[in-house]
Interface confidence: low
C-alpha cells in the first residue's frame, strides 16, 4: 500500500503479512497487507486490528477489527464506547456510511481514526498529537512502526522508476511491480482516470496512476481520492497537504516537499 | 543508553509535575524518584558520557533533597500516560478532564501539535 | 538567587593557554551540570562541551577534543575551562551555563561571559 | 556551517506573529525531545526561552511557543513587541553532541 508518514513522506510499500502501523502506549494498530495479484510484489490492506489500551479512569481496553468486507461500526466486544469507566465516551465509534467508512474519536489522547473500505481492500486514516505519538516504552524497539519509521528500504517500491517505465511509449512488461499489467489500462487512461478525481499531479495522483496501471481496478482511484479527503480533514496544516515529488535521498524513498 | 526511557516512565509516573508534586502527592513522588534512579543505575554501564543519563542522576538526587524523600522505600509502578506535560497542574488522575486531551493539555501549554499518518491503495 | 560569575578579560598570543572560572551560587552545584559556549565577535553560539561537578565526567566537542579540559572544584563551586594551543579564530566570547537537572536537558542559567583574545 | 539550519532573519510589526524555523535531521531535531531555544540581545548573554520543544520556564511570556513536526523545530512570538528585537538560537541535544543553530535575528519594524 501506499504511506504518509507522520512526518509526511510518502512511500509505496509492498510488506506483506501483518505489520505494525502505530505502537505506543496508548494504542496498537496492525494492518495485514495481501497481494494484489498473484504473484505481485504490489500489496494493498485486507485486515486493520486497533487496540485502544486500558487507560486510568476513561477507558478499558478496547479491540477494533475490520477486514475485507466486513466494517463493523462497534468493537469486537459489541460496544461502541469505551466501556463502563466514568470517561466512557472519550472513545466513541461512528458509522458514516454502513459497510464502507467508519470514524473513531479517542478524546482522551485527542486522535482520530478514519476506517474505509474502497473496492475490496482498507485504507486508514489517523490525526494524532505529537505527543501521542512519541509516547513509547522503548525508543530502541521502534524500528517498524510504520506511521513514524516508514517502511524498510527492501519492502519499497520504486515509484519513480516505475512511473518512467509507465510513461515510455512501449515499457517491458517487467517494469511493472506485478507480473502482467492489464491490457485494459493504458497509461493515458489511467492517467485520465486520475485526472477526473485528482486534478492536482501530487504523489496521491500518482500514486492513484500507479495502481492502475499495477491492477487494472478503477476502485483504486477511489482509494487515492478518499486518502487525499480524510487527509484535508485530519492534517493540521493544510499548505502540506499535497506533497509533490523530489529527488529521493535513498533508491525508493519519495520524500515530501510542500 | 536507555535513559530516555527512564525518563519517560519517570514523566510516567508523576502526572502532577515533576517538580512540583501536591503535598499529598510527595510519597507517590519520592517513590517514582527511586524507581527512576534504579532504572539509571541499570543503564549505567552503557551511558558514559551521555549528557541527558549525567543530568538525570544529578537531578535525581537533587529532586529527592528537595522533597525530603529517603533512599530507601518503596518504588512505583509506571503508569501508562505521559499526559499532560510535566508543569505545574495539581490535577488528580481521576478528573474527568483527563479524558479530554485537547482540555487538559491547554491548561498547561499552546495548542497540541497534530500530525497525520494514512495508509491506502497498493 | 541562581547566578554564574564568570573571570575577566584575557588577551592571549597564538599558541598559549587560556584559563577561564566559572563560580556558581545560589544552589547545589553538584545537581547540575555545566556547558560550556562560545561566540566568536558577530557569530553564532558554539557548544563546546560539558562536565558534572558531580562525577567529573565530561563530554567535549569533537573538534575541540585535545584542546579543551574542563575541570570542577566543588569545595569553591567553581567550574574551570582551559583552552590550549590557542589561534585567532578562537577569539570570542566565552559563555558558561547551568544544565537543568532530572530529566530535562536545557541551559537556564548563563554566566555573563569572558572575552578572550587571542592576538600576536 | 551549522548542523541546524536557521533563517538569518525575520521581521514583523508590533502585535504580529512571526515564526523562527531550525531544521536538522532525524537524530538532531526528528526523534529529539531536548530542543530549546535562547534569547540574545547584543552584547548580552543568552536567556533561555523554550526547552523540550515546547516547554516555557517561568518568567518567559506566553506569547512564545514552541512546536515540531517531522524534522523542523518552530519558535512562535505571537503580538511581537519591541524588546523581543533579539538573535534566537535553536539547541539540540542528540546522542552525545549539543548542537546549535546559525542564530535569526528578529526585527520589529
Known amino acids: 500500500p501506499h504511506l504518509r508518514t507522520f512526518t509526511d513522506h510518502f512511500q509505496t510499500c509492498k510488506v506483506q503479512g501483518a505489520w505494525p502501523l502505530i505502537d505506543n502506549n496508548y494504542l496498537n494498530v496492525q494492518v495485514t497487507n495481501t497481494p494484489v495479484l498473484p504473484g505481485s510484489a504490489a500489496t494493498a490492506t485486507s485486515k486493520l486490528t486497533i487496540i485502544f489500551k486500558n487507560f486510568q479512569e476513561c477507558v478499558d481496553q478496547k479491540v477494533y477489527q475490520a477486514e475485507m468486507d466486513e466494517l463493523p461500526s462497534a468493537f469486537a466486544d459489541g460496544s461502541k464506547n469505551g466501556g463502563d469507566k466514568h470517561g466512557a465516551n472519550s472513545l466513541k465509534i461512528t458509522e458514516k456510511v454502513s459497510g464502507q467508512h467508519v470514524e473513531i474519536q479517542a478524546k482522551y489522547i485527542g486522535t482520530t481514526i478514519v476506517v474505509r473500505q474502497v473496492g475490496r481492500y482498507l485504507t486508514f486514516a489517523v490525526r494524532m498529537p505529537e505527543e501521542v505519538v512519541n509516547a513509547v516504552e522503548d525508543r530502541d524497539s521502534q524500528g517498524l512502526y510504520l506511521c513514524l519509521r516508514g517502511c524498510p528500504l527492501n519492502q519499497q517500491i520504486d515509484f519513480q522508476a516505475f512511473r518512467a517505465n509507465a510513461e515510455s511509449p512501449r515499457r517491458p512488461a517487467a517494469a511493472s511491480p506485478s507480473p502482467v499489467v492489464p491490457e485494459t489500462f493504458p497509461y493515458e487512461t489511467a492517467v485520465a482516470k486520475c485526472k477526473e478525481k485528482l486534478p492536482v499531479e501530487d504523489l496521491y495522483y500518482q500514486a492513484c496512476v500507479f495502481d492502475l496501471l499495477t491492477t487494472g481496478d478503477v476502485n483504486f482511484t477511489l482509494a487515492a481520492y478518499y486518502a487525499l479527503e480524510d487527509g484535508k480533514m485530519l492534517h493540521s496544516n493544510k499548505d502540506k497537504l499535497h506533497l509533490f515529488e523530489r529527488t529521493r535521498e535513498l533508491p525508493g524513498a519519495v520524500a515530501a516537499a510542500a | 543508553c536507555k535513559i530516555l526511557k527512564c525518563n519517560s516512565e519517570f514523566w510516567s509516573a508523576t502526572s502532577s509535575g515533576s517538580h512540583a508534586p501536591a503535598s499529598d502527592d510527595v510519597p507517590e513522588f519520592c517513590a517514582a524518584l527511586r524507581t527512576y534512579a534504579l532504572c539509571t543505575r541499570r543503564t549505567a554501564r552503557t551511558c558514559r558520557g551521555d549528557l541527558a543519563y549525567h543530568s538525570a542522576v544529578h537531578g535525581i538526587e537533587d529532586l529527592m533533597s528537595q522533597h525530603n524523600c529517603s533512599k530507601d522505600g518503596p518504588t512505583s509502578q509506571p503508569r501508562v500516560r505521559t499526559l499532560p506535560p510535566a508543569g505545574d497542574s495539581q490535577e488528580r488522575s481521576d478528573s474527568p478532564e483527563i479524558c479530554h486531551y485537547e482540555k487538559s493539555f491547554h491548561k498547561h501549554s499552546a495548542a497540541p501539535n497534530y500530525t497525520h499518518c494514512g495508509l491506502f491503495g497498493d | 538567587e541562581v547566578q554564574l560569575v564568570q573571570s575577566g578579560a584575557e588577551v592571549k598570543k597564538p599558541g598559549a593557554s587560556v584559563k577561564v572560572s566559572c563560580k556558581a551560587s545560589g544552589y547545589t552545584f553538584t545537581s547540575h551540570g555545566i556547558s560550556w559556549v562560545r561566540q566568536a565577535p558577530g557569530q553564532g553560539l558554539d557548544w563546546m562541551g560539558w562536565?558534572?561537578?558531580?562525577?567529573?565526567?565530561?563530554n567535549y566537542a569533537q573538534k575541540l577534543q585535545g584542546r579543551v579540559t574542563m575541570t570542577t572544584d566543588t569545595s569553591t563551586s567553581t567550574a574551570y575551562m582551559e583552552l590550549s594551543s590557542l589561534r585567532s579564530e578562537d577569539t570570542a566570547v566565552y559563555y558558561c551555563?547551568?544544565?537543568?537537572?532530572?530529566?530535562?536537558?536545557?541551559?537556564?542559567?548563563w554566566g555573563q561571559g569572558t572575552l578572550v583574545t587571542v592576538s600576536s | 556551517q551549522s548542523a541546524l539550519t536557521q533563517p538569518r532573519s525575520v521581521s514583523g510589526s508590533p502585535g504580529q506573529s512571526v515564526t523562527i524555523s531550525c531544521t536538522g535531521t532525524?537524530?538532531?531535531?526528528?526523534?529529539?525531545?531536548?530542543v530549546s531555544w535562547y534569547q540574545q540581545h547584543p552584547g548580552k548573554a543568552p536567556k533561555l526561552m523554550l526547552y523540550?520543544?515546547?516547554k516555557r520556564p517561568s518568567g518567559v511570556p506566553d506569547r512564545f511557543s514552541g512546536s515540531k513536526s517531522g524534522n523542523t523545530a518552530s519558535l512562535t512570538i505571537s503580538g511581537l513587541q519591541a524588546e523581543d528585537e533579539a538573535d534566537y538560537y535553536c539547541?539540540?541535544?542528540?546522542?552525545?553532541?549539543?548542537?546549535f543553530g546559525g542564530g535569526t535575528k528578529v526585527t520589529v519594524l
Open positions: 539547541c539540540s541535544y542528540a546522542g552525545t553532541d549539543t548542537l
Open positions: 562536565i558534572s561537578p558531580y562525577s567529573g565526567n565530561t
Open positions: 523540550d520543544v515546547t
Open positions: 532525524s537524530s538532531s531535531v526528528g526523534d529529539s525531545i531536548y
Open positions: 551555563a547551568r544544565v537543568g537537572s532530572g530529566p530535562y536537558y536545557y541551559m537556564d542559567v
